[in-house]
Amino acid sequence: IVLRPSRVHNSEENTMRALTLKDILNGTFSYKTFFPNWISGQEYLHQSADNNIVLYNIETGQSYTILSNRTMKSVNASNYGLSPDRQFVYLESDYSKLWRYSYTATYYIYDLSNGEFVRGNELPRPIQYLCWSPVGSKLAYVYQNNIYLKQRPGDPPFQITFNGRENKIFNGIPDWVYEEEMLATKYALWWSPNGKFLAYAEFNDTDIPVIAYSYYGDEQYPRTINIPYPKAGAKNPVVRIFIIDTTYPAYVGPQEVPVPAMIASSDYYFSWLTWVTDERVCLQWLKRVQNVSVLSICDFREDWQTWDCPKTQEHIEESRTGWAGGFFVSTPVFSYDAISYYKIFSDKDGYKHIHYIKDTVENAIQITSGKWEAINIFRVTQDSLFYSSNEFEEYPGRRNIYRISIGSYPPSKKCVTCHLRKERCQYYTASFSDYAKYYALVCYGPGIPISTLHDGRTDQEIKILEENKELENALKNIQLPKEEIKKLEVDEITLWYKMILPPQFDRSKKYPLLIQVYGGPCSQSVRSVFAVNWISYLASKEGMVIALVDGRGTAFQGDKLLYAVYRKLGVYEVEDQITAVRKFIEMGFIDEKRIAIWGWSYGGYVSSLALASGTGLFKCGIAVAPVSSWEYYASVYTERFMGLPTKDDNLEHYKNSTVMARAEYFRNVDYLLIHGTADDNVHFQNSAQIAKALVNAQVDFQAMWYSDQNHGLSGLSTNHLYTHMTHFLKQCFSLSD
């Protein structure tokens, strides 16, 4: 059990107060993390509270300012990037968000040696992506879907691509679906380790159907937003990978990297690129039916100035029980011999573990094993491999950092974080300096987050980087809810849940229950992390019990649970939420006449299906920006889990799993449906179709739209949204205002 101390003592009770909705909306109890911007083995940069860019040297304990807030302010910079030769800094301003990761900005280059901005051959605006080479101060940037190269910041640019065209051809940046569902980045270009070569992707969206929606704005006529967006079964982008020599870019121009034959024989995706050396690159490809992935290691042929990808350097990863990988196919971490690598994939028992591949995947050496999962490989050095897993004490919702000594035989394993601040910290990530000389640990909870700096050799803590003292003090007079993480065993399935209980929780009383659900494939909601959010308020002030349940389809507990939902989305995720609710009722403290469910995105889909399950368990529920039919969602995501919406594949389940098909079943529940009209991700179409089906079935429901808002419902919409949902729930639970 993880109990977050509420710090309530009888003598203090009258000085303590409950959380308010205002606290949540104002972000009063938000926390800070500290991720060093490493520039060497022992130095990092950090933006100070007053906006100076400061260089810290761990070994001397000294720091000095390299760029003043005055310089930052002179161009309204909100971000910066130091060139690896430490001569220049790019300053980023006029940030303009596009999709989840992408944005455009204006860039200025500041010369540190001369204390002035670089004049002449200034960068165009707005730029879609810009980055320094890994060595020196070459610049690559994307402007109007084309890639440009500068040898030095003050030099004229060399144009690498010429065919870039809005919504048609994307060079060096992903299109919508690759950004959101495959790369999870705003960029699609990669420098080789010493900056000799630049690899980039070209996405051709010419034949992709376009989603169009109105953006109302302030004008007399609304604008129409058009996005090439392949829905399930539609035509996909065509991807090609090119590499150019940045020293002599005009010599032979960009050279295309060949696609493995077994991949190229049908529709496919490019999934990631990893440079190994300046003359060796590793590409990962995936069949459109995403159960076969190929990792291809390619070498530069000096004589032909081309890239050769021999079949002997192709490694196939295939899943027979589900899709390849977890959410994404994992990426390799190469060792110092520049050919062998470490990679996370399923072992014979169906748990994701680290494997060492020297020649073939069949001969892979398993590095970690057990009924838990390795989650991320942070760094491989000559003698150590650092990774995270949820092994410790068998809590899948924890993350600890481990070190395996690979320089010695047999390799020994040490948990770096397990016993550091055991009550406070059970969910970590890490950030390593060059050669893992030092590293920062960022602990996200369950206690108040804390960031610390450590010696990479001894693991000794050097200093606290951020401990959120102000937050700790602010929470001293707050009655926080209690949290517990436990599990239910039902029909050979383990259902982990987090329960958030009112501060003065009494098992002999009855409380209204709110289920918060996400439930998407390879997600995890039950995590040992700190949060003071809307559901904390509902427990603290409104006396609700809130529960989160990780059912079938969720991650980090083995393939049996993960792949249970393969080709059957919308069935087991819903069943498991219902099963958990029944178990919670059996615990005796839930008022079974006051049970609600709510979720956002995939969670909106699950909450809608749960409300329409006909069980009579739920009095009311909320769906925010729900998917309503898998035919409306993106191809890359949907087909990974559902296959194709064709007669000879899985059309039947596509049709059976819609929210609309269950319109009749909403008659006996109170349903609140919410969506942003400018949602580029889960299109407003989804909620429009639910509403139409409910109207056609003459079923009453409540709805709220947010004009010109996307999938995140940010800004003032957030306040309106949570206020509106609070009123809805309080009315449903007969709680006074």
Partner: nanobody
């Protein structure tokens, strides 16, 4: 008072060699990354070599293979060994923190290197 004193410059024929020294006083230089910079007449100051506290070095392509930066932490001194000098290496050479500290008035006087053809 923090000071940087560069020395070792002079007139040399193309293809010749020079060794520059920079003596640093003040705690900020102890253990921090240091660099050699140069400024030719009418040009901007530019980096020619950098060295971190653990001895990792960096050189731009224009001097790679010809110049070598080193440091003697006991003497608080950094050096620049310049071989195969070319006329385009003619400039005033300075040492400083790498990257330089802002508002750092004490760039030294520098040392003049002239390479004749």
């Amino acid at each position: 008072q923090v000071q940087l004193q560069e020395s070792g410059g002079g007139l040399v024929r193309a293809g010749g060699s020079l060794r520059l020294s920079c003596a640093a006083s003040g705690s900020i230089f102890v253990g921090n990354a240091m660099g050699w910079y140069r400024q030719a007449l009418g040009n901007q100051r530019e980096l020619v070599a950098g060295i971190t506290s653990d001895g990792t070095t960096y050189y731009p392509d224009s001097v790679k293979g010809r110049f070598t930066i080193s440091r003697d932490n006991d003497k608080n001194t950094i050096y620049l060994q310049m071989n195969s000098l070319k006329p385009e290496d003619t400039a005033v050479y300075y040492c400083n923190l790498w990257p330089p500290r802002i508002g750092f008035a004490s760039w030294g006087q520098g040392t003049q290197v002239t390479v004749s053809s």
